[in-house]
Interface confidence: low
């Protein structure tokens, strides 16, 4: 499933091409292992932003599946508990190019460690 | 009207594999999830996986990761599970239900439900 | 993975007398969108579950409007403010705001 979500976020990274979204996001670019669950749920998060302020159903599809995807693939984890991680307002604001490549990192890490 | 019609009952032996079907009808196939839930005998409603059909992408309870494959065909607007290693706690009734795209889509429509016995 | 604690197991009705089942989630349903993605099924004897409200609180499609539901966040309550003799069967509550989905333990309502 997480190579799936990789292949959303470039599907949303090219649909967002053509427009012109100037929101920043919270993001993560320096995750920290014992971290990345935390990470990864303000990056979802986060994601409906782009959905919300896009108004493109195309983008909004994507989103919604890929959030079931990564919460599907979140649930297989078990339910773990992280300490000490940052809350999601107070990781760096980005804007989407950046934020999607900092997303894009970030499941590789779930890949390299499923 | 919709409906999701299923093929008949199954009986089974221990370690073998079983594959229900689900034939959708009265909606656009690809608009909509189809959810497997299983019922064992006089028990309660445990969800096994659902299908995107557009996509064809698919998620699974921890349970049953490894051990069922979802599938649906778009050209017969049909959906398949299909469970392998079965023993004797699989036994139930398996449903396919319909659920709108998307990570909040209610489950509305259920099918008539499979009957699968795994018995040596 | 977010349980539900439905109560009571059994739940014996006078018809025309009402009737209330709870459902507990183990943790809040209520998205940022506003919606609670709480359900509630109805299994009648040798049937399949049918849709009866979603969203909590919005009544499912030619569903008797004697049918209710109520709550927020992760206390639910589904009302029938007046039993028929064909309300009798097992309801489930379910949450829908992410995967694994997954039902109350079910409440069997019995015509007394």
């Known amino acids: 499933n997480w190579v799936n979500v990789i292949s959303d976020l470039k599907k949303i990274e090219d649909l967002i091409q053509s427009m012109h979204i100037d929101a920043t996001l919270y993001t993560e670019s320096d995750v920290h292992p014992s971290c990345k669950v935390t990470a990864m749920k303000c990056f979802l998060l986060e994601l409906q932003v782009i959905s919300l302020e896009s108004g493109d159903a195309s983008i909004h599809d994507t989103v919604e599946n890929l959030i079931i995807l990564a919460n599907n693939s979140l649930s297989s984890n078990g339910n773990v508990t992280e300490s000490g991680c940052k809350e999601c307002e107070e990781l760096e604001e980005k804007n989407i190019k950046e934020f999607l490549q900092s997303f894009v990192h970030i499941v590789q890490m779930f890949i390299n460690t499923s | 009207q919709v409906q999701l019609v299923q093929s008949g009952a199954e009986v089974k032996k221990p370690g073998s594999s079983v594959k229900v079907s689900c034939k959708a009808s009265?909606?656009?196939?690809?608009?909509?999830?189809v959810h497997w839930v299983r019922q064992a005998p006089g028990q309660g409603l445990e969800w096994v996986g659902g299908?995107?059909?557009?996509?064809?992408?698919?998620v699974f309870a921890q349970k049953f990761q490894g051990r069922v494959t979802i599938t649906a065909d778009e050209s017969t607007s049909t959906a398949y599970m299909e469970l392998s290693s079965l023993r004797s706690e699989d036994t139930a009734v398996y449903y396919c239900?319909?659920?709108?795209?998307?990570?909040?889509?209610?489950?509305?429509?259920w099918g008539q439900g499979t009957t699968v016995t795994v018995s040596s | 993975d977010i349980v539900m604690t439905q109560s009571p197991l059994s739940l014996p009705v006078t018809p025309g007398e009402p009737a209330s089942i709870s459902c507990r989630s183990s943790q809040s349903l209520l998205h940022s969108n506003g919606y609670n993605y709480l359900d509630w099924y109805l299994q009648k004897p040798g049937q399949s579950p049918q849709l009866l409200i979603y969203?909590?609180?919005t009544l499912q499609s030619g569903v008797p409007d004697r049918f209710s539901g109520s709550g927020s966040g992760t206390d639910f309550t589904l009302k029938i403010s007046r039993v028929e003799a064909e309300d009798v069967g097992v309801y489930y509550c379910m949450q829908a705001l992410q995967t694994p989905l997954t039902f109350g333990g079910g409440t069997k309502l019995e015509i007394k």
């Open positions: 969203a909590a609180t």
């Open positions: 299908i995107n059909p557009k996509r064809g992408d698919t």
């Open positions: 239900a319909r659920g709108g795209l998307g990570v909040f889509g209610v489950v509305d429509v």
């Open positions: 009265g909606y656009s196939f690809t608009d909509y999830y």
